[in-house]
Interface confidence: medium
């Protein structure tokens, strides 16, 4: 397995609507045509897969219809957006990139982006 450097921001604050976006950039050493991007969440030493997408270079990322992730790609950069986040989803979100084809297979794992999610205060009851 050949290693590949993956860069991502250290910290991101989710919006009040529970949406967080960050860029995952990989230093592609080969001429990959097919790339797989996986977002992993690490919390309390447990790692779970949030979402994953395989895409052709130059094409859009396609996540499953029920995925909480969307994304776009540009060169060696992937712009990832995670939605539907709540305070309990605060954690370290790790970007994993695999150059699937053609050989050789490259694997890169970022250091993670700490996403902070703050649940919005409920609106006070109104007399109107």
């Amino acid at each position: 397995c050949k290693a590949m450097h993956v860069a991502q921001p250290a910290v991101v604050l989710a919006s009040s609507r529970g949406i967080a976006s960050f860029v995952c950039e990989y230093a592609s050493p080969g001429k990959a045509t097919e790339v797989r991007v996986t977002v992993l969440r690490q919390a309390d030493s447990q790692v779970t897969e949030v979402c994953a997408a395989t895409y052709m270079m130059g094409n859009e990322l396609t996540f499953l219809d029920d995925s909480i992730c969307t994304g776009t790609s540009s060169g060696n950069q992937v712009n990832l957006t995670i939605q539907g986040l709540r305070a309990m989803d605060t954690g370290l979100y790790i970007c994993k990139v695999e150059l699937m084809y053609p050989p050789p297979y490259y694997l890169g794992i970022g250091n993670g982006t700490q996403i902070y999610v703050i649940d919005p205060e409920p609106c006070p009851d109104s007399d109107f």
């Epitope: 050949k2 395989t54 053609p102």
Partner: antibody, heavy 120, light 111 residues
Framework: EVQLLESGGGLVQPGGSLRLSCAAS????????MNWVRQAPGKGLEWVSA????????YYADSVKGRFTISRDNSKNTLYLQMNSLRAEDTAVYYC?????????????WGQGTLVTVSS | QSVLTQPPSASGTPGQRVTISCTGS?????????VHWYQQLPGTAPKLLIY???QRPSGVPDRFSGSKSGTSASLAISGLRSEDEADYYC???????????FGGGTKLTVL
């Protein structure tokens, strides 16, 4: 257990067409890239074509480019090779072979092959 | 003509050690791509013998070993046995051809 079963071979006239199939079982088909490799009678192995797991990337040997088309149906766990404008030199046993992607790629598993004979 | 070069034949007596070479170029073995070896017994499909230069799949005896250096690789078979009589092929991915390339094969005869 990984199983690859080729079918569709036979006798065809020069200029004719044939479609080979490879039924796969025992693994998650869509996670693996697949290949066709051929062997002419009494000769060595020759790689023909490859297709990535999603089917989005395809590669061909120069000797078949423009004449052969590789494809896959991940819902049916089946790999195909559409062969058009066949020539006598395409006569061979055609094997489908599974790529391995953990750690690196190599042709890990092979079918038993199907014989294609191009002759008038 | 094959992209990877192998001797067409090799031979040895039972118990002997035999080495088969595989020479490539800067677009395949020399580009850092791994070399894999296949054994083809008469009338059967090729079987993976060595992968990633020197790794043996489960079930392959440790009499078989592989190595790689620069633009070439080699397969060594020690303690030769009659059942080792077969054709042996090396393979690697080629950058410029965007595909797998094979050696022409080496027919091993156990005398």
């Amino acid at each position: 257990e990984v199983q690859l079963l080729e079918s569709g071979g036979g006798l065809v006239q020069p200029g004719g067409s044939l479609r080979l199939s490879c039924a796969a079982s025992g693994f998650t088909f869509s996670s693996y890239s697949m290949n066709w490799v051929r062997q002419a009678p009494g000769k060595g192995l020759e790689w023909v074509s490859a297709i990535s797991g999603s089917g989005g990337s395809t590669y061909y040997a120069d000797s078949v480019k423009g004449r052969f088309t590789i494809s896959r149906d991940n819902s049916k766990n089946t790999l195909y090779l559409q062969m058009n404008s066949l020539r006598a030199e395409d006569t061979a046993v055609y094997y489908c072979a599974r790529d391995r992607v953990e750690m690196n790629q190599w042709l890990a598993d092979w079918g038993q092959g199907t014989l294609v004979t191009v002759s008038s | 003509q094959s992209v990877l070069t192998q001797p067409p034949s090799a031979s040895g007596t039972p118990g002997q050690r035999v080495t088969i070479s595989c020479t490539g170029s800067s677009s395949n073995i020399g580009a850092g791509y791994d070399v894999h070896w296949y054994q083809q017994l008469p009338g059967t499909a090729p079987k993976l013998l060595i992968y990633r230069n020197n790794q043996r799949p489960s079930g392959v005896p440790d009499r078989f070993s592989g190595s790689k250096s620069g633009t070439s690789a080699s397969l060594a078979i020690s303690g030769l046995r009659s059942e080792d009589e077969a054709d042996y092929y090396c393979a690697a991915w080629d950058d410029s051809l965007n595909g797998w390339v094979f050696g022409g094969g080496t027919k091993l005869t156990v005398l």
